[in-house]
Interface confidence: medium
């Protein structure tokens, strides 16, 4: 008996009623008497809807199901789920009996549309080109997961410093939460586009912000301008200089160094001498290359609080400023793998890998191959705690069912030091223990 | 020397079968997975799928799901790939690879020399 | 799927010029592989790993990058160099290459 479902996935929206198509060709004489109908769950062969010795025996699914009784003795079996909700994704399958049998499985896809994007902007005040700001872009009661993206005013996406987090409710929604780290320029707008890729519904915001404009003096200050990478625990030099005119002495000179988002005092000379470090006497500068127009400041004992912006500010008659980042970095541990269970392990046998890497900074990205280098991107949850100092310890889980050998490695790379801590971990296709025994 | 020889090029008619083979000399032909990539005529490159000889395992691109066959024969060190429902977009250059390296980095460093498939009534 | 998407995808330069291409991934990835195809002949690695030369590939090549952005770069230009180039990875299935960058004669 040939039994016909659409091949694609049946789209329903959170709420509203679907219809898992299903259709028979009946015989000429065929009765409804005759028919035995079974809707189940594809995967748990749970009962969902029957009709069975003539009759509608309803539903076995929460109350939520009918059939489109005055049609099925035209071989309509099609199934009308009501009020669907994120739990009822999955695979449905249509048993029809008459003497011969048939059976075919239609996917239910649930969607839900994310809501337009609320954008919030921190710091929201006093805003200067140079500052750096959080721009926090949230959408609401989305399902599936939603993919994000930010783009500047001209459409140009913009990936650099972009968090994105997406927490489902009890109902399944998911709720998007992207944040993007930025340096301002003189104005721009910024966007975030939420999409469904199911619904293939965009969802955007965004935001224009005009800083005010920084009093510009006529002294040129030059900063570099890539990020000074520090390691924790080293020294760092935050170079910025000057060009002194003929005549000029230190006596003239203003030099302040302080963050750039806090205004925080880092250090300072004035009145020709050096009034020390306001920062945690950390902090120096090179005070016999200053009058040469040397302004630039030495950092101790790097710590990862020490990430951020630092403007360096030069008042002679004039003045000038410039804003120099430093980035902290640390490198990751040689990855521990410990695997559980490790004892009379069999090929089928499900068995979680976790590897570990320690102290790093910043966040480390983790990746999990086989032992001819394929991903292994299936079930992998990756979690990474920041201990006292700022730093890393990252742990990646990687559940997987066993073949008859195989090696299972992880790669945790720095993505500031571009480096990489590896380990791996292979298993016979003998019944075994891990660590192997001496 | 390491090589790939990949067997000669085929004409097809459409809703036909094509069976490329693909004989691996020169290393441990169990060691290695070997993948497919394909090249229509002035496009780029197209993984299809790939096979682990000593396993058996295959992978294949969604895109051919249900088309592609991948096998491999331990005992002559060959692999072959089997299409099925050719048509005319089908028309490419077939080319097996070696994916080669150590933990955690992998590439492919051998290529056969490319198998001309040509699908037309 | 993991996009990779090379720009440019022509390139005319001159024997001598310094030439770098870019491979932008839609998602990060581990590494990037690069190879250098000739009309009528199979791909030929040059640079695994992001940055690791392949045997035999001179030195005026050389790759860098991370997370989404990687680029190979000749540094001068040499008349066997005109070819075509692609990217490739497979942190995440499928394997996928860049759509080739052709490097013409100016």
């Known amino acids: 008996l040939e039994v016909q479902v659409p091949e694609d996935p049946v789209v329903a929206l959170v709420g509203t009623d679907a219809t898992l198509r299903c259709s028979f060709s009946p015989e000429p004489g065929f009765s409804l008497a005759q028919l035995n109908l079974i809707w189940q769950l594809t995967d748990t062969k749970q009962l969902v809807h029957s009709f069975t010795e003539g009759r509608d025996q309803g539903s076995a699914y929460a109350n939520r199901t009918a059939l489109f009784l005055d049609l099925l003795a035209q071989g309509n079996a099609s199934l009308r789920l009501q009020r669907v909700r994120v739990a009822d994704e999955g695979s449905f399958t249509c048993f029809v009996s008459i003497r011969d049998f048939g059976s075919a499985a239609v996917s239910l896809q649930v969607a839900a549309p994310y809501s337009k994007p609320s954008m919030t902007l921190e710091p929201n005040k006093d805003l200067r080109p140079g500052d750096t700001v959080t721009i926090t872009c949230s959408s609401y009661r989305g399902y599936p997961e939603a993919e994000v993206f930010w783009q500047d005013g001209q459409g140009a996406p913009l990936t650099g410093n972009v968090t994105t987090s997406q927490m489902a409710n009890e109902q399944g929604l998911f709720d998007v939460h992207s944040v993007l780290r930025v340096v301002l320029g003189a104005n721009g707008t910024y966007s975030c586009l939420v999409r469904n890729p199911v619904l293939q519904q965009d969802a955007h915001g965004s935001i224009t912000i005009t800083p005010q404009r920084s009093p510009t003096g006529a002294v040129e200050v030059q900063v570099p301008e890539d990020p000074v990478v520090a390691l924790v625990g080293t020294d760092a030099t935050l170079r910025c200089s000057f060009s002194p005119e003929p005549g000029f002495s230190l006596a003239q000179l203003n030099l302040i160094w302080q963050l750039t988002d806090t205004k925080q005092l880092v250090h300072s000379f004035t009145e020709g001498r050096d009034q020390g470090s306001a920062y945690a006497n950390r902090t120096a500068l090179f005070l016999d290359l200053l009058a040469q127009g040397n302004a630039s400041l030495r950092l101790q004992r790097v710590r990862v609080a020490d990430e951020g912006s630092f403007t360096c500010f030069v008042s002679i008659r004039d003045f000038g400023s410039a804003a120099v980042s430093l980035q902290v970095a640390a490198p990751y541990s040689k990855p521990s793998m410990t695997l559980e269970p490790n004892k009379d392990l069999r090929p089928g046998d499900t068995v979680t890998i976790t590897c570990s890497s320690y102290r790093g900074y910043p966040e480390a990205e983790v990746f999990w191959q086989d032992g001819q280098g394929a991903p292994l991107t299936g079930n992998v949850t990756t979690s990474q705690m920041a201990n006292e100092q700022g730093l890393f310890d990252v742990h990646s889980v990687l559940r997987v069912v066993l073949g008859a050998n195989g090696t299972y490695s992880c790669l945790v790379r720095n993505p500031v030091l571009q480096q990489d801590a590896h380990g791996s971990v292979t298993i016979t296709g003998q019944p075994m223990t891990f660590p192997p025994e001496a | 020397e390491v090589q790939l020889v990949q067997s000669g090029a085929e004409v097809k008619k459409p809703g036909s079968s094509v069976k490329v083979s693909c004989k691996a000399s020169?290393?441990?032909?169990?060691?290695?997975?070997i993948h497919w990539v394909r090249q229509a005529p002035g496009q780029g490159l197209e993984w299809m799928g790939y096979i682990n000889p000593n396993s058996r395992n295959t992978d294949y691109a969604q895109k051919f799901q249900g088309r592609v066959t991948l096998t491999a024969d331990k005992s002559t060190s060959t692999a072959y790939m089997e299409l099925s429902s050719l048509r005319s977009e089908d028309t490419a250059v077939y080319y097996c690879?070696?994916?080669?390296?150590?933990?955690?980095?992998?590439?492919?460093?051998?290529w056969g020399q490319g198998t001309t498939v040509t699908v037309s009534s | 799927d993991i996009q990779l998407t090379q720009s440019p995808s022509f390139l005319s330069a001159s024997v001598g010029d310094r030439v770098t291409i870019t491979c932008r991934a839609s998602?990060?990835?581990?590494?990037m592989n690069w190879y250098q195809q000739k009309p009528g002949k199979a791909p030929k690695l040059l640079i695994y790993a992001t940055s690791n030369l392949a045997s035999g590939v001179p030195s005026r090549f050389s790759g860098s990058g991370s997370g989404t952005e990687f680029t190979l770069t000749i540094s001068s230009l040499q008349p066997e160099d005109f070819a075509t180039y692609y990217c490739?990875?497979?942190?995440?299935?499928?394997?996928?290459f860049g759509q080739g960058t052709k490097l013409e004669i100016k």
């Open positions: 490739q990875q497979w942190s995440s299935n499928p394997l996928t």
């Open positions: 020169g290393y441990s032909f169990t060691s290695y997975t």
């Open positions: 998602s990060s990835v581990s590494y």
């Open positions: 690879a070696r994916y080669s390296g150590s933990t955690p980095y992998w590439y492919f460093d051998v």
